[in-house]
């Protein structure tokens, strides 16, 4: 088993990259002198206890920043949040920590990230741009849920 996180960069189909701004991830057009975040990702070690055929369950963090993406309900609405967390602490837990897990599915060059805690909710960015990453159930409408993930070796 791979037991160190892999690193990657992400952009959406409009070539916007993820940037950390005031502890919030936003998607912005790539420009010079900009620092897109590097993603840290690691597969859940308890994959056999999760749903099959939904994608590879992964923990998603920001490389070197001890921040991980998680899903939590605010009122009745699942929301995407950044939490201070060591991705390896999540990886080593005795059970899947579902609020921090995403099913990563790949179709060609496109990747989607579906919340394990809230099935049917996907990481998305508004088509507007310059907006925070969100969770959405609305696929292919006002929000983009397809991303390009490039692994860095």
């Amino acid at each position: 088993k791979i037991d160190t996180p892999q690193r990657g960069s992400i952009q959406d189909i409009n070539h916007r990259v993820w940037v950390l701004q005031d502890q919030t991830l936003i998607a912005v057009p790539r420009k010079d002198r900009m620092s897109p975040v590097t993603i840290a990702l690691i597969s859940c070690r308890h994959v056999e206890t999760l749903e099959k055929d939904r994608g590879n369950p992964i923990y998603l963090g920001l490389n070197g920043l001890n921040l991980c993406l998680m899903c939590a309900k605010v009122g009745d609405q699942p929301t995407l949040q950044l939490k201070e967390k060591d991705i390896m602490d999540l990886y080593n837990q005795p059970e899947p920590v579902k609020s921090f897990l995403f099913y990563h599915s790949q179709s060609g060059r496109n990747s989607t990230f579906e919340s394990v805690a809230f099935p049917g909710w996907f990481i998305a960015v508004s088509s507007e741009g310059g907006c925070p990453l969100i969770l959405t159930q609305e696929l292919g409408k006002a929000n983009t849920t397809d991303f390009g993930l490039t692994m860095l070796f």
Partner: antibody, heavy 121, light 110 residues
């Protein structure tokens, strides 16, 4: 208030099967893992296994694999423990317990009141 | 499969500190065993105290603390109270299953 309410005591004959129940209230059962634990007099606790109620996947202690079956009915927030081919060794108190992630770790934080199973002819 | 061993009984007095331990037959207990401590009071009343070796469960008094001491997991009650008289069980995680100890009966002489 978080509660795990277990079904009543059972007296069954050797070779029979039995199904014990654990009904959750005060929390969303799909957000946790529900475990079953066996307690015999003067013998401590034995972990039987667990279920993820959201998905239905299970894990068992090798000793109980094939003997115990854990299932869930999310419509009634209930988890069941089924035992087959009962023997006197299965006479014990059985507990359900919630394993819940809070802060940075998992905790066996809430427990049912226990169900006494007596296997006797 | 590992066997998890605890002291069968300990006695303390109100206000004193007492430490209960949890040993694994398969070697040193580490943070990877995610030691949990559970309290059983009369009439089958169980409550979780500690998770992840040293994290207190919500609502658990600060006098309860978890740690590793040498090659064992430990539960320390600093300033024991009469209501702490109970049986205390540890549970250790081993890759894909939990193993509970036999329990320690703690008597608080009051």
């Amino acid at each position: 208030e978080v509660q795990l309410q277990q079904s009543g005591a059972e007296l069954v004959k050797p070779g029979a099967s039995v199904r014990l129940s654990c009904t959750a209230s005060g929390f969303n059962i799909k957000d946790t893992y529900i475990h079953w634990v066996k307690q015999r007099p003067e013998q401590g606790l034995e972990w039987i296994g667990r279920i993820d109620p959201a998905i239905g996947t299970t894990r068992y202690d090798p000793k109980f694999q094939g003997k115990a079956t854990i299932t869930t009915d999310t419509s009634s927030d209930t988890v069941h423990l089924q035992f087959s081919s009962l023997t006197s060794e299965d006479t014990a108190v059985y507990y359900c317990a919630r394993l819940h992630y809070f802060g940075n770790n998992f905790f066996f934080d809430y427990w049912g009141q226990g169900t006494t199973l007596t296997v006797s002819s | 499969q590992a066997v998890v061993t605890q002291e069968s009984a300990l006695t303390t007095s109100p206000g004193e500190a007492v430490t209960l331990t949890c040993r694994s037959s398969s070697g040193a207990v580490t943070t990877s065993n995610y030691a949990n401590w559970v309290q059983e009071k009369p009439d089958h009343l169980f409550a979780g105290l500690i998770g992840g070796t040293n994290d207190r469960a919500p609502g658990v008094p600060a006098r309860f603390s978890g740690s590793l001491i040498g090659d064992k997991a430990a539960l320390t009650i600093t300033g024991a109270q009469t209501e702490d008289e109970a049986i205390y069980f540890c549970a250790l995680w081993f890759s894909n299953h939990w193993v509970f100890g036999g329990g320690t009966k703690l008597t608080v002489l009051g």
